[in-house]
């Protein structure tokens, strides 16, 4: 278990306990309960109050991070008396030993890399372990392939993202023979951490007066349809003076991705490249390979 739990309670205790794997807070059921509520308070004094489970003697916290330390609290009224109990959930271990600079990104539609740095006060023998839990099924994924630096795990590579949902809980635990290591946890949205590939199948066809650029939307991990994409086209005239402005064109995603622009013959040599983003986030992909059209003597 990754932390010490300290109970602050009156004489007749509710025996409050917290399971960090399931994020479930439970207590001993009291006869003739008329009212019960549970909540947590974090270090910034933010209060999170989940719905009570049907049996009213437990509650599950869905989207919380615990590494800064939290205090759980349970209030129960029965027809005879009232109960109140606090449960301190500190992040035990030496300050500054937890993994830091944690980040993840999804790429190539079905791969993910997470990286972190060793805590500044972590001993030389520290070892970190990454666990991921999805929001739907609460299934735990253990890191299958660690990235190492001098034997210490400082990253993780996943090539099977089937266990992830749209929002996931990431936990980096640490161990050492010398001292207790603090944990780090984070909630990440897959849509915010995905880096798209550039659009594929980019083609340019020209007639005497116009050029038509077509492309296919990139394959993504997220389930996105055509209106969920935004594109940017960089139409560039070759052999122009350095510092000349490129023409950047914004195009909304459509069922048939195309951009038609006037370009009469004879036309100078041009290149076009395209990048893609989620329309809501605009986290741009890298540019596609430049496609050339026109002629040097245009």
């Amino acid at each position: 278990e990754k932390s010490d739990l300290r109970t602050v309670a009156p004489a007749s205790s509710l025996n409050v306990r917290f399971d960090s794997r399931t994020m479930n807070l439970s207590w001993d059921c009291q006869e003739n309960t008329t009212f019960s509520k549970c909540f947590l308070t974090d270090k910034k004094n933010r209060v999170v109050e989940p719905r009570l489970s049907n049996n009213e003697c437990s509650c599950t916290f869905r989207e919380i991070c615990l590494h800064e330390g939290v205090t759980f609290e349970v209030h129960v009224n029965t027809s005879q008396r009232g109960f109140q109990q606090k449960l301190l959930y500190p992040n035990s271990g030496r300050e500054g030993t937890a993994a830091q600079n944690f980040s993840c990104f999804i790429y190539n539609a079905d791969l993910m890399n997470c990286t972190w740095a060793r805590g500044p006060t972590a001993p030389r023998d520290v070892q970190y372990f990454l666990y991921i839990r999805n929001s739907k099924r609460r299934r735990e994924i253990r890191c299958p392939y660690y990235i190492q630096d001098s034997g210490t795990h400082v990253g993780c590579h996943l090539d099977n993202l089937s266990g992830l949902t749209s929002r996931n809980y990431f936990l980096v635990n640490g161990t050492s023979r010398e001292i207790g290591i603090q944990f780090f946890d984070s909630l990440l949205d897959t849509k915010k951490i995905e880096r798209f590939n550039p659009p594929s199948n980019v083609t340019v066809r020209c007639n005497t007066t116009h050029c038509l650029v077509r492309w296919k939307q990139p394959r993504t991990y997220q389930k996105l349809s055509y209106l969920d994409f935004q594109y940017q086209l960089d139409v560039h005239r070759k052999n122009t003076q350095p510092g000349t402005e490129n023409l950047l064109i914004n195009v909304s995603g459509d069922l048939e991705n195309r951009y038609n622009f006037p370009s009469s013959e004879p036309r100078a040599k041009h290149s076009v490249k395209i990048r893609a983003a989620d329309v809501r986030i605009l986290n741009w992909s890298s540019w596609s390979e430049a496609i050339e059209f026109g002629s040097d003597d245009g």
Epitope: S225, Y226, D228, L255
Partner: antibody, heavy 120, light 111 residues
Framework: QVQLVQSGAEVKKPGASVKVSCKIS????????IHWVRQTPTKGFEWMGG????????VYAQRFQGRVTMTEDTSIDTAYLTLSSLRSDDTAVYYC?????????????WGKGTMVTVSS | QAVLTQPSSVSGAPGQRVTISCTGS?????????VSWYQQLPGTAPKLLIY???KRPSGVPDRFSASKSGTSASLAITGLQADDEADYYC???????????FGGGTKVTVL
Amino acid sequence: QVQLVQSGAEVKKPGASVKVSCKISGHSLSELSIHWVRQTPTKGFEWMGGFDPEENEIVYAQRFQGRVTMTEDTSIDTAYLTLSSLRSDDTAVYYCSIVGSFSGWAFDYWGKGTMVTVSS
Amino acid sequence: QAVLTQPSSVSGAPGQRVTISCTGSGSNIGAPYDVSWYQQLPGTAPKLLIYHNNKRPSGVPDRFSASKSGTSASLAITGLQADDEADYYCQSYDSSLSGSVFGGGTKVTVL
């Protein structure tokens, strides 16, 4: 240009079944998420179901579960809606549509609708 | 009874601005799921006007705009024209129903 061409109007007796088709032209059905929505003067628009990429299967509205079947024949780019045990309050215009955005499910292209009348 | 609540009708003179509200709950608009708006002219299929709360598909004039806040959304039509006379519907996804939900529709009349 993408078009959704629906089958013609139907008149059915209570208890019968109806099958409405939706032929996609200008794009491959296998790349699309087709949903069915019906409209009545009293209840307005009611979503019936369609392909949900998150679940990777066709999902149905709870109120139609057990009575509705949606199928697709990708070889001829045609989607089908079958509604069984018809009642008089199933009298409606039935539309097929393409989901243009999975965020909130925005229905972009629509068929012209198929009028289904249930009457004894 | 529609899951999303809209006024049954609004009206305005040509050139004026009208707004249509759409009120939902914490399981749909407030969840937060994106809101779409549709225009339906008499005897025709609906046409997508707005998606992603405030984005217009190509071909929809910028006289149509929309916004979303909390569990409500609204559609605004500026410079009202005679051919804007139609029924307007809001739509979103609802997690408790695991499906799409619509508003009851608002009839816009140009005086």
